[in-house]
């Protein structure tokens, strides 16, 4: 069926970057400036996304692909395809509707985004605190107190290279 349709439908021959122009006898016309078609056989070209204001252009629009935006310094992307830019806060803070706010005692945020989270309660997982928490860092849990024999030294593990929230989707 698809093959039959493509033989009958001249628009199916129009490649990405063009559109099937009904006003010109269904000839494949190039997409006008600031528009694109990412698939073949399209009857219109889509308008290119414009990265304005707090958005900045990460990838220019071409005749076959939309522009991609990211955020200016001090902001980070939110949502699919960076649909929003959200203000960065400092580590040890969280973004509320009233702006950046310091984490309360007993909570931390090791990112420039996200919430202040309660320190991990090591004892709930049968462990002990190796390193105390701060506004910027969670506590580090170690072996249970019974596992630490006299004279045994406990070494603080290195901080992870990347924390949740910093990973690209």
């Amino acid at each position: 069926f698809e093959r039959t349709r493509s033989l009958q439908d001249p628009c199916s021959n129009c490649p990405a970057g063009t559109f099937c122009d009904n006003n010109r006898n269904q000839i494949c016309s190039p997409c006008p400036p600031n528009s694109f078609s990412s698939a073949g056989g399209q009857r219109t070209c889509d308008i290119c996304r414009q990265c304005k204001g707090v958005f900045r252009t990460r990838k220019e629009c071409s005749s076959t692909s939309n522009a991609e935006c990211d955020c200016t310094p001090g902001f980070h992307c939110l949502g699919a395809g960076c649909s929003m830019c959200e203000q960065d806060c400092k580590q040890g803070q969280e973004l509320t509707k009233k702006g950046c706010k310091d984490c309360c005692f007993g909570t931390f945020n090791d990112q420039k985004r996200g919430i202040c989270r309660p320190w991990t309660n090591c004892s709930l997982d049968g462990k002990s605190v190796l390193v105390n928490g701060t506004k910027e860092r969670d506590v580090v849990c170690g072996p249970s107190p019974a596992d630490l024999s006299p004279g045994a030294s406990s070494v603080t593990p290195p901080a992870p290279a990347r924390e949740p929230g910093h990973s690209p989707q």
């Epitope: 939110l78 973004l95 509707k97 909570t107 969670d138 992870p160 949740p164 990973s167």
Partner: antibody, heavy 120, light 106 residues
Amino acid sequence: QMQLVQSGAEVKKPGASVKVSCKASGYLMQGYYMHWVRQAPGQGLEWMGWINPNSGGTNYAQKFQGRVTITRDTSASTAYMELSSLRSEDTAVYYCAREGEAVGLDLDYWGQGTLVTVSS
Amino acid sequence: SYELTQPPSVSVAPGKTARITCGGNNIGSKSVHWYQQKPGQAPVLVIYYDSDRPSGIPERFSGSNSGNTATLTISRVEAGDEADYYCQVWDSSSVVFGGGTQLTVL
């Protein structure tokens, strides 16, 4: 694409423990906190806790403290939720859910759920 | 602990507008997220940060939040919108869900 695939249904006796797994694919597991939420038959959603897959740091709802343990194996891109001292009221569908990036903590992707039945 | 209150059920005729409320003390200062759950399926995020839609969610779904009430609005309701809807917030140390609202399309 982004997927969370959970282990199969379980039937347990009261007093026993159950361990449910949640395998993440389509994204870097270390990049996002993982949560566990349960739903008893005909009831609403009830949050149980989270794990930071990077550090292993956890936070549990007060109701479950002492009975729940959330762990992870980043090499297998899998999170686990173990619930001990099971009682009939723990019969529920247990979901893992990835924390999103919105202000104020949303859960943007969910596993298909694992039915745990506690019955003598 | 923080509590969220939702009406147990809301009924609406196809093509009309459904409004589902979520009440909580000064909820307007918090970020509210909404989930849709159809029978036998996992919840799906339909609104985050009060009023933003994830990709793939129709524009018919919108949200607002001020004072002590957040609202999920579904315009031009379709039979496929029949489901349970849950609001959710983060409150200092725990994730809190509303009790859920069953939306019936008449």
